[in-house]
């Protein structure tokens, strides 16, 4: 049979290296030789390229070399397939060399901030040595912060006569390290060079860009003063490397600004002992370049009634995230403060907090929370300077089976009845929210029975038992991940009752 017609011809001019054309050879059953027929020099010259490889993959490509390649130029390329049965030709294809030229990547040799110009870095590079002198080059510059995985891109062109191979990348974050890569192409070409080697550069440092401020209110002490733990952190979106030398804090009673107290610290929290009235707390962070904007927080008076608007709240795990959703009755509240900490018996030391705006849900990556730990999550509504009543729930980022079953006891043994009681599993052993308990019981040599009850029940009465019979009983506590049995207990029903 004749060879299959070569299809999908594609050509690339690897600038000043070779012009390579490839094609789909079709299913060949016998040895097929391919000849690429070319006209070039704007139709004034022609020549052939014959594949000489014995492997079928390599036979579907052929290259022309300098000096018989000039640019600009128009080519026609036709591929002829020949086997013992005859010759078949492809369609004639037409190529403008400028449209298919591919150069080496440029070389970035310097990425630096420009003195006194904020949030900008200048990229300097060397044009690919092998690039057409007669063509302008277009560039794509891609950049990302060091700890990010997603690239941003910017496109620009350079005139071939432009000696200045630099680009000023603006609108960046201050004092942030960026990864830069550059690629180029002949302006008319559809083929981009590979990306250059990546180069790092950092924007200039600035004064701190701001703080987020929060508080934990504690019960008033005997003297009427109330401990308030102030917490703060860099504002969201602040540069990772942003340096802070310290913090200035000042606070005063809402009713009297003259009674302002000030303090300095280098810590990221501070315990204040305030009177029972309402207070304003303000603070700034500073470094060698200046001060951040002021962050301000109102501390309510002890007897002040806070508003309530969260009606229902639930937590669920979805796609490696813990999602907390709530419903609010106050449409004008659109900022919320989320607090979360592990539910341990001791005083919580690791309180985390984060604000949410324009949403009534909050998500956190599962791996930011410890698996099998119970977390207390509170959501505070915030309206202007007022903080509302929090709504709190408990949730696990990842549930496991309890590490031990319930400790079980048998009480009130009768002729045909018994009461099974059990204790809650300690928090540290639950590994998840206990959703139910299952009581398994079985007469000696008899059939087993089970009964499931909800997690609020810690005792259960078994009835219709056989008199004077030995039973074995155990209770299983279950989370969404599965259940764990407690130790099994034996008991024997009575032979008669005093009431008989």
């Amino acid at each position: 049979a004749l060879p299959a017609k070569p299809e999908n011809i594609s050509c690339v001019y690897y600038y000043r290296k070779n012009l390579t054309c490839t094609w789909s050879p079709g299913k060949e059953t016998s040895y097929t030789q391919y000849t690429v027929k070319r006209t070039y020099a704007f139709g004034e010259k022609h020549d052939n390229c014959t594949t000489n490889s014995s492997t079928s993959e390599n036979r579907a490509s052929c290259s022309f070399f300098l000096p018989r390649i000039t640019i600009p130029d128009n080519y026609t390329i036709e591929v002829e397939a020949e086997n013992g049965d005859g010759v078949i030709k492809s369609h004639m294809t037409y190529w403008r060399l400028e449209n298919i030229a591919k150069t080496e990547p440029p070389k970035i040799f310097r990425v630096k901030p420009v003195l006194g110009i904020k949030r900008m870095i200048q990229i300097e590079w060397i044009k690919p040595e092998l690039a057409p002198v007669s063509s302008d080059l277009k560039y794509t510059l891609r950049f990302r912060t060091v700890n990010s995985t997603s690239w941003m891109e910017v496109n620009f062109a350079k005139n071939r006569k432009d000696k200045n191979q630099t680009y000023n990348l603006t609108g960046l974050q201050p004092f942030t390290e960026y990864v830069i890569a550059l690629r180029c192409a002949v302006k008319e070409s559809k083929f981009w060079s590979d990306w250059s080697q990546e180069k790092m550069g950092m924007t200039e440092e600035e004064a701190p860009c701001g703080l987020e401020l929060w508080r934990v209110l504690k019960p008033a002490e005997a003297d009427g003063r109330r401990p308030v733990r102030l917490l703060w952190k860099k504002a969201r979106g602040a540069p990772v490397l942003e340096k802070t030398l310290g913090y200035n804090i000042w606070y005063y009673p809402e009713s009297n600004t003259n009674l302002t107290e000030t303090m300095n610290t280098t810590n990221q929290q501070l315990e204040l002992h305030l009177g029972g009235e309402s207070f304003w707390v303000s603070m700034i962070s500073y470094n060698s370049l200046g001060k951040s904007p002021v962050a301000t927080l109102r501390i309510p008076a002890i007897q002040e009634k806070s508003f309530q608007c969260i009606e229902v709240m639930q937590a669920c795990v979805a796609e490696d995230q813990l999602v907390v959703k709530w419903q609010s009755s106050a449409l004008d509240v659109n900022t919320w403060m989320i607090e979360w900490f592990p539910d341990v018996d001791s005083e919580p030391t690791t309180l985390s907090w984060e604000s949410v705006s324009q949403a009534t849900n909050w998500t956190i990556q599962q791996d930011k929370l410890k698996p099998f730990w119970c977390y207390n999550i509170s959501v505070y509504p915030m309206l202007h300077d007022k903080v509302g009543e929090p709504y709190s729930i408990q949730a696990y980022a990842k549930e496991g089976v309890p590490s031990e079953g319930p400790e079980t006891k048998v009480e009130n043994i009768g002729v045909k009845t018994v009461t099974i009681t059990w204790k809650e599993i300690p928090k540290s052993e639950r590994k998840g929210i206990i959703c139910n308990y299952t009581i398994f019981y079985q007469a000696e040599g008899g059939k087993g029975f089970s009964k499931t009850v909800n997690s609020s029940i810690l005792q259960y009465g078994l009835e219709s038992l056989k008199r004077k019979t030995s039973y074995i009983v155990q209770v299983m506590a279950s989370t969404s991940a599965g259940g764990t049995n407690g130790t099994s207990i034996n008991f024997k029903t009575l032979s008669f009752s005093v009431f008989e």
Partner: antibody
Framework: QVQLVQSGAEVKKPGASVKVSCKAS????????MNWVRQAPGQGLEWMGL????????DYNPQFQDRVTITADESTSTAYMELSSLRSEDTAVYYC??????????????WGQGTLVTVSS | DIQMTQSPSSLSASVGDRVTITCQAS??????VAWYQQKPGKAPKLLIY???TEAQGVPSRFSGSGSGTDFTLTISSLQPEDFATYYC?????????FGGGTKVEIK
């Protein structure tokens, strides 16, 4: 900047061989064709052949086909022209010359300083 | 092989003169002609390629024209540094051949 530096003058006996070198600098050696041209004393220019250092492809003037060998060493960015079976009429200045223009194939844009080869018994 | 016939083989001219050198190819070579200037003891220097494109850094007084088989190099106003030998060369394909040269001397 682009430079081609050739080896020094040679004096050879008839029947011997000579190998002239041309060291390139200031550009990507594999990206450009290297030609060899000779000029006998008081005479015109005569093209001997070329090499593409990228793939080692050569093209010779049929007049020299049997006697000339052009090679290139990418590691040292050096091209070589060897002429064998020398005779007195091979006495000439031998030039290496690089092509230079995308739109002008076989043009000789940058030249070496020349190497005088004298063939004399 | 393509033969390149150059004329005149020499000419005398004065500074400021317009000088024309011609070159004839033995067959149609479209516009694949280059012109070189060579001074005594020096390597040739490319002036024009593709019959009329000036090489980088070449003064505008040098111009080329022609296509097919007949080509011309013109120096519009001869300068003292232009006294040299000029060669045409076809760059249509291998083997490359040069014209015999035209020596431009001071009158």
């Amino acid at each position: 900047q682009v430079q081609l530096v050739q080896s020094g003058a040679e004096v050879k006996k008839p029947g011997a061989s000579v190998k002239v070198s041309c060291k390139a600098s200031g550009y990507t050696f594999t990206g450009y064709i290297m030609n060899w041209v000779r000029q006998a004393p008081g005479q015109g220019l005569e093209w001997m052949g070329l090499i593409n250092p990228y793939n080692g492809g050569t093209d010779y003037n049929p007049q020299f086909q049997d006697r000339v060998t052009i090679t290139a060493d990418e590691s040292t960015s050096t091209a070589y022209m060897e002429l064998s079976s020398l005779r007195s009429e091979d006495t000439a200045v031998y030039y290496c010359a690089r092509d230079g223009y995308d739109d002008g194939p076989y043009t000789l844009e940058t030249w070496g300083q020349g190497t005088l080869v004298t063939v004399s018994s | 092989d393509i033969q390149m016939t150059q004329s005149p083989s020499s000419l005398s001219a004065s500074v400021g003169d317009r000088v024309t050198i011609t070159c004839q190819a033995s067959e149609d070579i479209y516009s694949f002609v280059a012109w070189y200037q060579q001074k005594p003891g020096k390597a040739p220097k490319l002036l024009i390629y593709n019959a009329q494109t000036e090489a980088q850094g070449v003064p505008s007084r040098f111009s080329g024209s022609g296509s097919g088989t007949d080509f011309t190099l013109t120096i519009s106003s001869l300068q003292p540094e232009d006294f040299a030998t000029y060669y045409c060369q076809h760059h249509y394909d291998s083997p490359l051949t040069f014209g015999g040269g035209t020596k431009v001397e001071i009158k």
